[in-house]
Interface confidence: low
Amino acid sequence: DSSKWVFEHPETLYAWEGACVWIPCTYRALDGDLESFILFHNPEYNKNTSKFDGTRLYESTKDGKVPSEQKRVQFLGDKNKNCTLSIHPVHLNDSGQLGLRMESKTEKWMERIHLNVSERPFPPHIQLPPEIQESQEVTLTCLLNFSCYGYPIQLQWLLEGVPMRQAAVTSTSLTIKSVFTRSELKFSPQWSHHGKIVTCQLQDADGKFLSNDTVQLNVKHTPKLEIKVTPSDAIVREGDSVTMTCEVSSSNPEYTTVSWLKDGTSLKKQNTFTLNLREVTKDQSGKYCCQVSNDVGPGRSEEVFLQVQYAPEPSTVQILHSPAVEGSQVEFLCMSLANPLPTNYTWYHNGKEMQGRTEEKVHIPKILPWHAGTYSCVAENILGTGQRGPGAELDVQYPPKKVTTV
């Protein structure tokens, strides 16, 4: 009963001229051990002789006849379970059907396996996920329907022709279910990889090129922006004009909206790629950036720090502490907004300049009664001198002096 023969092997095997083919195969013949095995190429049943005709690639019989192909074709199986075969090297004209003619004491069986041998090494196939987004790790898969113990190969990943640094995991399958070589590369694409060519290159053991597959990366990313400002140092004086320009260096998909932000807050009615600031005031100093959005999300440019320079504003004096007790220490602080910061201060006590006092702070370690009075200051920077503020009063408390009776 020929239904007792059960085989498992890949239905079709793929190779190319000069490579080899390893055919994983198992079988079961319930009525006893294998007595004769013949491997045919394109066998055809001859009704007249009740035998199969065809090229005999391998023969293992009781009488020990060995065809000339025996060195190239090897039966690596056994008498009851394993029917694995190897053809090394494999040739173009090996394409077609291999027929495994099995005979036990009472039963015969012809098992057919398809062999597809191409003239040149066929290319692997790169599989990409449906979407690739910047900075999100993806797995690139390169698959080749080939693996053979006698013909080592390697799959090499290239980005724009340069080997990729990321470590790829290569796996092979040489089982009765499947024969393939697979390389998986975990890769976190950056926006700059958009449009770049990824290649999976099939190489022999010496690194010689055999074939390849290429794909163009479609990396979804937020808009990438450059901000340009006139004047280029972004330092202006009050009343000057400033122009900022936003340039989209890359966006995938296309951008949809444009906005400008100052200190993180959106500027109203500023939805073009140029921001014109006329007759700027000091209040317009701050960090500016443009924001352009696409379906992936918003992209922001680097921040430009706009410095609107102005002469010091009217100053105020802060006294720590008033009233002060005679003998205690007191500190005066000159407060004046200015850009750039004041480089020189002039202090006044009761309307008279205090010689040698040019710092922002004045420290008097031991207060005397005559230190009481009005203190004011003037701040100065490269753009001018500020207005002297109203000043502040220092009260000094002290015990009675030179008591006289009247």
Partner: antibody
Framework: EVQLVESGGGLVKPGGSLKLSCAAS????????MNWFRQAPEKGLEWVAY????????YYADTVKGRFTISRDNAKNTLFLQMTSLRSNDTAMYYC???????????WGQGTSVTVSS | QLVLTQSSSASFSLGASAKLTCTLS???????IEWYQQQPLKPPKYVME???????STGDGIPDRFSGSSSGADRYLSISNIQPEDEAIYIC?????????????FGGGTKVTVLG
């Protein structure tokens, strides 16, 4: 329980337009890519369009490219298919389908019928 | 070109085991596919995702009588102890992104009839 409910189908003349909607519930809509598929009477299934979670990526079948527009409103858990320049061979049952795993179309709506006829 | 091939129909006796085949085009023999079940006048129902190594994950509400296996370019859907409610068209599907275009193709479907 995951539910996808399509609406907006009907009878339309050739060259006309229709907008299909799909209301999603029972899952976090913004976590999944969504598709439209269709099935003409007595015919096989045909993929129509795909939209990624955040509408970043959109793909169309060649047969509808330039005529159909897929979109989604994650705030309202709704998928749309705007169909214009409709042809008689667009007549089909249109299904809203969630995509998970590798390409697993794991939940299908009951479908909405579109008939294009003069 | 990505192609899936299925036989058009198959009949099985009630309680028997069924094995349906979906064959991938040879250059895509390592792809993951999906199996769907479609009963008359109903939408398709996701049955499972099936990998080259035979590992699979089944959809919600799919009985464990359904299993998957693979051999080369062939992907199998097996139904043990087949029941009348299993009578349906079983369709395999596969997705890929080629260059910049996404494709999702289906096999022609196998109509399963349960006898007895």
């Amino acid at each position: 329980e995951v539910q996808l409910v399509e609406s907006g189908g009907g009878l339309v003349k050739p060259g006309g337009s229709l907008k299909l909607s799909c209301a999603a519930s029972g899952f976090t809509f913004s976590d999944y890519g969504m598709n439209w598929f269709r099935q003409a009477p007595e015919k096989g299934l045909e993929w129509v369009a795909y939209i990624s979670r955040g509408s970043h990526t959109i793909y169309y079948a060649d047969t509808v490219k330039g005529r159909f527009t897929i979109s989604r409103d994650n705030a309202k858990n709704t998928l749309f298919l705007q169909m214009t320049s409709l042809r008689s061979n667009d007549t089909a049952m249109y299904y809203c389908v969630r995509m998970a795993g590798y390409y697993a179309m794991d939940y299908w709506g009951q479908g909405t019928s579109v008939t294009v006829s003069s | 070109q990505l192609v899936l091939t299925q036989s058009s129909s198959a009949s099985f006796s009630l309680g028997a085991s069924a094995k349906l085949t979906c064959t991938l085009s040879s250059q895509h023999s390592s792809y993951i596919i999906e199996w769907y079940q479609q009963q008359p006048l109903k939408p398709p129902k996701y049955v499972m995702e099936l990998k080259k190594d035979g590992s699979h994950s089944t959809g919600d509400g799919i009985p464990d009588r359904f299993s998957g296996s693979s051999s080369g370019a062939d992907r199998y859907l097996s139904i043990s102890n087949i029941q009348p409610e299993d009578e349906a068209i079983y369709i395999c599907g596969v997705g890929d992104t080629i260059k910049e275009q996404f494709v999702y193709v289906f096999g022609g479907g196998t109509k399963v009839t349960v006898l007895g």
